[in-house]
């Protein structure tokens, strides 16, 4: 008799999830000499242990602690780039500006980027059919708790000037409900972080508005200022130039030394 399985509202675990995580870990540790000591099988075991056999609506940050410990990594705390609703451009940027780091440039962020996963209570099976949706089902699901945990740690590690890339084409340039707005903003450490500088990426060259005056940016400024961190904001009017430079990182007009 087929066993009854909980049907969740979100997509199921990414196919070949264990193989993908393991392969990403091996690739990352090969590329990053400072992480060569990491045992990828142990990383996978810790990752698996965080959600396998557990109810996918009852995951806690504690469940991920063994994984966090194995993935401990030092990035230059003054070279951190946060982002919200503009992931691809942020990632393209750090691929070119190699001395800056998004969360997904770290081992743990790299392992989980764009993946979905969940298990089932009291079975060692991975659920490839469906996983809880953050809104429709529950917020304490394996994916959401993972990103909340690593995002909090990443923000806590930041120092000096922290940059955040925001999407100026969205109705809410700063969204309090995003990971940046709900987790990272509140975990920047005022004793370490001097300034949060927002880069608001415009939709096109013809858009001459000052999006740093947007009400949601003012809201972000208010939140940051109340935390005794300085705030600054810059309009970035050249997504075309930005992308041109991303595609051609060696381009002389992008890395101009004058």
């Amino acid at each position: 008799v087929p066993r009854w399985r909980q049907q969740w509202s979100g997509p199921g675990t990414t196919k070949r999830f264990p193989e993908t995580v393991l392969a990403r870990c091996v690739k990352y540790t090969e590329i990053h000499p400072e992480m060569r000591h990491v045992d990828c099988q142990s990383v996978w075991d810790a990752f698996k242990g965080a959600f396998i056999s557990k109810h996918p609506c009852n995951i806690t940050e504690e469940d991920y602690q063994p994984l966090m410990k194995l993935g401990t990594q030092t990035v230059p705390c003054n070279k951190i780039l946060l982002w919200s609703r503009i992931k691809d451009l942020a990632h393209q940027f750090t691929q070119v500006q190699r001395d800056m780091f998004t969360l997904e440039d770290t081992l743990l962020g790299y392992l989980a980027d764009d993946l979905t996963w969940c298990g089932e209570f009291n079975t060692s099976k991975i659920n490839y059919q469906s996983c809880p949706d953050w809104r429709k089902d529950c917020s304490n699901n394996p994916v959401s708790v993972f990103w909340k945990t690593v995002s909090r740690r990443f923000a806590e590690a930041a120092c000096d000037v922290v940059h955040v890339m925001l999407n100026g084409s969205r109705s809410k340039i700063f969204d309090k409900n995003s990971t940046f707005g709900s987790v990272e903003v509140h975990n920047l450490q005022p004793e370490k972080v001097q300034t949060l500088e927002a880069w608001v990426i415009h939709g096109g060259r013809e858009d001459s508005r000052d999006l740093c005056q947007d009400p949601t940016i003012k809201e972000l400024e208010s939140i940051i200022s109340k935390r005794n961190i300085q705030f600054s904001c810059k309009n970035i009017y050249r997504p075309d130039k930005f992308l041109q430079c991303v595609k051609n990182p060696e381009d002389s007009s992008c890395t101009s030394e004058i």
């Epitope: 858009d207 001459s208 000052d210 904001c233 810059k234 002389s252 007009s253 101009s256």
Partner: antibody, heavy 120, light 105 residues
Framework: QVQLVESGGGLVQPGGSLRLSCAAS????????MNWVRQAPGKGLEWVSN???????YYADSVKGRFTISRDNSKNTLYLQMNSLRAEDTAVYYC??????????????WGQGTLVTVSS | DIELTQPPSVSVAPGQTARISCSGD??????VSWYQQKPGQAPVLVIY???NRPSGIPERFSGSNSGNTATLTISGTQAEDEADYYC????????FGGGTKLTVL
């Protein structure tokens, strides 16, 4: 070293036309956006026009519809075709290379300029 | 478009610090560059992206930008620094300030 040399300036009557050229050397011309910036006698700098590497063009409102910027990458040359000239177009016209980063742009290299005088 | 306003002139004694302001509505939201122009010569970039100095520009030149004012600071001003200075920003189009004549007394 980077060199920009403008030519084609001179005296022209109101309503007349003139074509300015800027010969570039010392860098890969096709890799850079280029600009024209002008300066009326005794006045400040005013951006006129921009052409991107891919050929997209941009103009100041004061010259839109009258001036046309173009480039010939095979000749390493930038052009500014100026039609329906007015007295207020009298200025030294500079050719300037657009440099920058992902975040912002600026004019790192300038030519010595060519004087355009519009007068009857 | 943003309008950039500069004082027409600034005077400074040799060896003293000169500060040239460039004001505009929330200019801190835009990156600012500064150019030096001597009589009969083309402009020369002295500061870009608010506070970065091109190679070959003396360390006495520095820039800052926040709120409604960007500032070019020349510490230990020398006679050769006497020139016109222009601020410039970009908001989909390039905008220059009206220029400031720096006189070294």
């Amino acid at each position: 070293q980077v060199q920009l040399v403008e030519s084609g300036g001179g005296l022209v009557q109101p309503g007349g036309s003139l074509r300015l050229s800027c010969a570039a050397s010392g860098f890969t011309f096709s890799s850079y956006a280029m600009n024209w910036v002008r300066q009326a006698p005794g006045k400040g700098l005013e951006w006129v026009s921009n052409i991107q590497r891919v050929g997209s063009t941009y103009y100041a409102d004061s010259v839109k519809g009258r001036f046309t910027i173009s480039r010939d990458n095979s000749k390493n040359t930038l052009y500014l075709q100026m039609n329906s000239l007015r007295a207020e177009d009298t200025a030294v016209y500079y050719c300037a290379r657009e440099d920058g980063s992902y975040m912002t742009d600026y004019f790192a290299y300038w030519g010595q300029g060519t004087l355009v005088t519009v007068s009857s | 478009d943003i309008e950039l306003t500069q004082p027409p002139s600034v005077s400074v004694a040799p060896g003293q610090t000169a500060r040239i302001s460039c004001s505009g509505d929330n200019i801190g939201h835009y990156y600012v560059s500064w150019y030096q122009q001597k009589p009969g010569q083309a402009p020369v970039l002295v500061i870009y992206s608010d506070s970065n100095r091109p190679s070959g520009i003396p360390e006495r030149f520095s820039g800052s930008n926040s709120g409604n004012t960007a500032t070019l600071t020349i510490s230990g001003t020398q006679a050769e620094d006497e020139a016109d200075y222009y601020c410039q920003s970009y908001n989909g189009t390039y905008v220059f300030g009206g220029g400031t004549k720096l006189t070294v007394l």
